[in-house]
Structures are given as structure tokens and as C-alpha cells.
Interface confidence: medium
């Protein structure tokens, strides 16, 4: 265990000090705003945390450029279909960048969940999960949008969530 061993030890110690950015945000009663904006998230309580990423008005803000696995799950459910429901529900992760005026689609899914209601039971459940690796620059933001957000069920922070970690 000569110089090479102590060099490896030094590298290991340095790596342990370089915290890999990661965040897991959870659904809360305040998530649904009705304003047409992105979903808002709990950042501290329960399972939620931020490490090496920041949060602002529903957005995860990247402080360190790199490749990130970003993900979001939303639990959908209801009794019958809400008035005014579009034929499909869109759940998406979108990027905001200072270099472009509009949000950019990163990952998007669509479904028509209300069809799961039956004549014998108007209660229905569905969910949507998105996840993928994208490159993000420092200062760029990622948000979650659901149209129609009225279908999102929040309950206890385990059903609807949003997160990212550097890979």
C-alpha cells in the first residue's frame, strides 16, 4: 500500500466531498394552482429534499451543468369525468432556458383516463410516469405540467412526485 494506495484514498475522499446534485420533490395540497402554471412541489417535508439543485416556483433549477436523469410521476383519479376535460391528458417535463423564450418539451405522455370509468363504478384510477436523461446547463430549469391538473391526486406525497439527479 505505497503511494498508489494513498492516491486512491485521496481520490475517494475528494469524490465523497463532491456531492452529486439530486432532488426529489413531492405533491402537496398547494401543488395545484388553477393558474395554468406548472405544478408546485414540497421541497423539505417528508420524503422531499434538495441537494445541489435549487427550487423556484415549481421549477428545479440546475446549478451545475451535466447529464441528469429527470423523472415525474402523477397519480390521476376521479369520480366520473370533470366538466371541460379535453379528450387527452398531457403530463410533461419541460425545460426553461435563458437562450430560448419558450419552454421546450423534454418528456411528454398523453392518455385518456376517464374512459376507465364504467357504468357500475364511476371511480377510476390511472397514473403517468416519465423519466429520461437530458443535458442541462447551469441556470436552466425543469418544470412539470399536467393538463388537466384537476385530475391529479396528491394525498400523502408518495403518489405524485418530481425529481432529478446527475448521472
Amino acid at each position: 500500500d505505497g503511494p498508489a494506495g494513498s492516491w486512491e484514498q485521496l481520490i475517494q475522499e475528494r469524490r465523497s466531498h463532491e456531492v452529486n446534485p439530486a432532488a426529489h420533490l413531492t405533491g402537496a395540497n398547494s401543488s395545484l394552482t388553477g393558474s395554468g402554471g406548472p405544478l408546485l412541489w414540497e421541497t423539505q417535508l417528508g420524503l422531499a429534499f434538495l441537494r445541489g439543485l435549487s427550487y423556484h416556483d415549481g421549477a428545479l433549477v440546475v446549478t451545475k451543468a451535466g447529464y441528469y436523469y429527470i423523472y415525474s410521476k402523477v397519480q390521476l383519479g376521479g369520480v366520473g369525468c370533470p366538466l371541460g376535460l379535453a379528450s387527452t391528458i398531457t403530463h410533461g417535463l419541460y425545460k426553461r432556458t435563458p437562450r430560448y423564450p419558450e419552454e421546450l418539451e423534454l418528456l411528454v405522455s398523453q392518455q385518456s383516463p376517464c374512459g376507465r370509468a364504467t357504468s357500475s363504478s364511476r371511480v377510476w384510477w390511472d397514473s403517468s410516469f416519465l423519466g429520461g436523461v437530458v443535458h442541462l446547463e447551469a441556470g436552466e430549469e425543469v418544470v412539470v405540467r399536467v393538463l388537466d391538473e384537476r385530475l391529479v391526486r396528491l394525498r400523502d406525497g408518495t403518489r405524485s412526485y418530481f425529481g432529478a439527479f446527475m448521472v
Epitope: 393558474s35 370533470p82 384537476r150
Partner: antibody, heavy 121, light 111 residues
Framework: QVQLVQSGAEVKKPGASVKVSCKAS????????VHWVRQAPGQGLEWIGA????????SYNQKFKGRATLTADKSTSTAYMELSSLRSEDTAVYYC??????????????WGQGTLVTVSS | DIVLTQSPDSLAVSLGERATINCKAS??????????MNWYQQKPGQPPKLLIY???NLESGIPDRFSGSGSGTDFTLTISSLQAEDVAVYYC?????????FGQGTKVEIK
């Protein structure tokens, strides 16, 4: 603050139609359902139906389907309820009410002042 | 349609005493841990006013002497200490499915 202001009282003959308006202010009109509820003199409350101003989608109590027409004008933030083929038992106060944002719990958190519609020959 | 039956039809309570109104639904109005039952107060010549939503949530600006409880098919509105201004008709309403229906109303008076 949220306000719903309804049109004035109407007197109509049997067989005629009536159109009641409900002008909304103080909130995003296209994000909340507008419900219509009526109350006959000395009686309880009866739900007629609702309109979603965002796209004009409607839901009706089967009892009123075919006679009631609910619409909304986004440009003026006004909802309308038209009731046709009026009969004496339609004499009532008609209320518009804002439905809660969360569709699975359609409670009515703000109400108009009511419009008395009298049907009499 | 879901039928809501309130009891009693009328209630006379002394000032400062507790008033309790019951509402029974013809089927469960529960979904995902919430009960879709709401309560309104209506005074003569006025529109109804929301008091309690989803069974137990107090609407903002409503005095905390009003409370709601229950689940499934059985619900209760309680006024813990009746005040003169509480004289009104009280209605339960289900928002579980349309057509949304109301109870027949309970008239609360001062004894």
C-alpha cells in the same frame, strides 16, 4: 374579490323562454365551473347543471336536459342559463354559483344574488 | 340520483347551546379518503353560503363554532354554541356525482 352579479327579475308567460345572465369578476373565469341552482318559493335547492367556461362543456341534471341551455362568454366573463317551455312550476329564484376548482369536490363557494323568474299567465 | 335526507326538519336551541344536524346519503360519497359532502347556510332573502366542504373543512371566514364530521353515508353539522345570527336554514349537498343533490334543509331557530 370574487363576485357573481345576476340579471334582474323576469316575468314570463307559460311556454315562453327566459335567459338569465351571471357576470363574474375577481377570478379566472375560464378555470372554474359555473353551476346553476334554483329554489322554488319556500322550497329547497335543486341543481340544474353547470358550464365550464374554458371550452363551453356542459353537464345537466337529466330533469332539465332539453329545456335548459347553459353557455358562457369568455370575452365578457358572463355565464347564461336559458330555460324554455316555461311552466308555472318553474317559478323560482335562479342562482349561479362558482364551483370549486377541484372537480371531484364541486362545492359552491361563491353565489350570485339570485334572479326571481315568475311564470304566470 | 343520490338522495340526501336531513334530520331533524327543524331545530330549536337555546343561545349558547349546541345544535346538531344530520344528513344521510342513499349511497357512499367517499373517494380517495375524502367525503364529498358540503354544508350551506341560507338566511331569508339571501343566497346560500358555503360553511363546510368535503365533510370537515371549514370555509375561510366561517366562525369555528361550525364544524362538520362523518364519512360514507352519515354526516353531521355541529354548531357548538348557537348565536342569534345562526338562525337560518342549513342544507347538506353531495358532490360525489351529478346530478349534485341537496338535502331538504333543516331550519334552526332560537328556543
Amino acid at each position: 374579490q370574487v363576485q357573481l352579479v345576476q340579471s334582474g327579475a323576469e316575468v314570463k308567460k307559460p311556454g315562453a323562454s327566459v335567459k338569465v345572465s351571471c357576470k363574474a369578476s375577481g377570478y379566472t373565469f375560464t378555470s372554474y365551473n359555473v353551476h346553476w341552482v334554483r329554489q322554488a318559493p319556500g322550497q329547497g335547492l335543486e341543481w340544474i347543471g353547470a358550464v365550464y367556461p374554458g371550452n363551453g362543456d356542459t353537464s345537466y341534471n337529466q330533469k332539465f336536459k332539453g329545456r335548459a341551455t347553459l353557455t358562457a362568454d369568455k370575452s365578457t366573463s358572463t355565464a347564461y342559463m336559458e330555460l324554455s317551455s316555461l311552466r308555472s312550476e318553474d317559478t323560482a329564484v335562479y342562482y349561479c354559483a362558482r364551483g370549486s376548482y377541484y372537480y371531484t369536490s364541486s362545492y359552491f363557494d361563491h353565489w350570485g344574488q339570485g334572479t326571481l323568474v315568475t311564470v304566470s299567465s | 340520483d343520490i338522495v340526501l335526507t336531513q334530520s331533524p326538519d327543524s331545530l330549536a336551541v337555546s343561545l349558547g347551546e349546541r345544535a346538531t344536524i344530520n344528513c344521510k346519503a342513499s349511497q357512499s360519497v367517499d373517494f380517495d379518503g375524502d367525503s364529498y359532502m358540503n354544508w350551506y347556510q341560507q338566511k331569508p332573502g339571501q343566497p346560500p353560503k358555503l360553511l363546510i366542504y368535503t365533510a370537515s373543512n371549514l370555509e375561510s371566514g366561517i366562525p369555528d363554532r361550525f364544524s362538520g364530521s362523518g364519512s360514507g353515508t352519515d354526516f353531521t353539522l355541529t354548531i357548538s354554541s348557537l348565536q342569534a345570527e345562526d338562525v337560518a336554514v342549513y342544507y347538506c349537498q353531495q358532490s360525489y356525482e351529478d346530478p349534485f343533490t341537496f338535502g331538504q334543509g333543516t331550519k334552526v331557530e332560537i328556543k
